[in-house]
Amino acid sequence: LTCLGGFASPGPVPPSTALRELIEELVNITQNQKAPLCNGSMVWSINLTAGMYCAALESLINVSGCSAIEKTQRMLSGFCPHKVSAGQFSSLHVRDTKIEVAQFVKDLLLHLKKLFREGQFN
């Protein structure tokens, strides 16, 4: 997590700053949403537990051609210790449940804000 520089600052940033920046990006997405986010694309729901950053990325990486979430995808990759590619699935996916990207982002945002408030940055 010390290698998360480059999104909003030139050098490495503390984990709390990286998480705050991710939250702020998700807030931007939800607030600037005019038409359905990513044309209403559906993604696998995930369990918001340990390892959820990789799981979130694995879900969102399957959405292509949606510029609104490209920065989020890049930021999530900084929190995930392994390389994630399209079609990859983790046990954290709720494989029988698909939700719209907009709802996925909303749920993720709510959870990340609580992690930030509780001081859980990893």
């Epitope: 709390s16 709510l110 408030r117």
Partner: antibody, heavy 120, light 112 residues
Framework: EVQLQQSGAELVKPGASVKLSCTGS????????IHWVKQRPEQGLEWIGR????????KYDPKFQGKATITADTSSNTAYLQLNSLTSEDTAVYYC?????????????WGQGTTLTVSS | DVLMTQTPLSLPVSLGDQASISCRSS???????????LEWYLQKPGQSPKLLIY???NRFSGVPDRFSGSGSGTDFTLKISRVEAEDLGVYYC?????????FGGGTKLEIK
């Protein structure tokens, strides 16, 4: 309009238990934290604990551990405070409050308080 | 636990005077996320507490600008520049940085 509506006053006997409720309207309790605060007659405020209704993550002040149990029912948008083995020390006004919904920085709305009297 | 110590216990003032309430924490209340969750609440008789100041110095919406908060680390102050009758009541500082969260003992602002 955001509101927290608490249950009515209670008069209970020593040794009994009581369950107080706090129902949110105008917001979803899953989107925030609900806290409980105690105020004994003519005394200050004491934080009892809080619940994250989205995942039932609960934190207590250790001095209320065993005395207080905080729960939530998201289907009715209600948080509860159960107090057991009541003594005169538990006679107080109990408030619920919510953390504001942006960054959970502070308590922006409070319930009106529930007066609990423990007396034989 | 973080002990929050408020002084004075009682503060007699004349209307129009400045009032100052001090709150000292037994340890730093800077949260691991960098924020300092220090709040000030006012409780009037028979009412629920109401938020005045959050994160040390931010006025809550609708709070008059005669209220100001300052401080850092372990020392915090609430100032009321010109006390009005509606300001009377008990003021509490509160730290929401370290669980268990804790309130100060309260300061009663009353007419001299």
């Amino acid at each position: 309009e955001v509101q927290l509506q608490q249950s009515g006053a209670e008069l209970v006997k020593p040794g009994a238990s009581v369950k107080l409720s706090c129902t949110g309207s105008g917001f979803n309790i899953k989107d925030t934290y609900i806290h409980w605060v105690k105020q004994r007659p003519e005394q200050g405020l004491e934080w009892i604990g809080r619940i994250d209704p989205a995942n039932d993550n609960i934190k207590y002040d250790p001095k209320f551990q065993g005395k207080a149990t905080i729960t939530a029912d998201t289907s009715s948008n209600t948080a509860y405070l159960q107090l057991n083995s009541l003594t005169s020390e538990d006679t107080a006004v109990y408030y619920c409050a919510r953390s504001e919904e942006n960054w959970y920085d502070f308590f922006d709305y409070w319930g009106q308080g529930t007066t609990l009297t423990v007396s034989s | 636990d973080v002990l929050m110590t408020q002084t004075p216990l009682s503060l007699p003032v004349s209307l129009g005077d400045q009032a100052s309430i001090s709150c000292r924490s037994s340890q730093s209340i800077v949260h691991s996320n960098g924020n300092t969750y220090l709040e000030w609440y006012l409780q009037k008789p028979g009412q629920s507490p109401k938020l005045l100041i959050y994160k040390v110095s931010n006025r809550f919406s609708g709070v008059p600008d005669r209220f100001s908060g300052s401080g850092s680390g372990t020392d915090f102050t609430l100032k009321i520049s010109r006390v009005e009758a509606e300001d009377l009541g008990v003021y509490y500082c509160f730290q929401g940085s370290h669980i268990p969260y804790t309130f100060g003992g309260g300061t009663k602002l009353e007419i001299k």
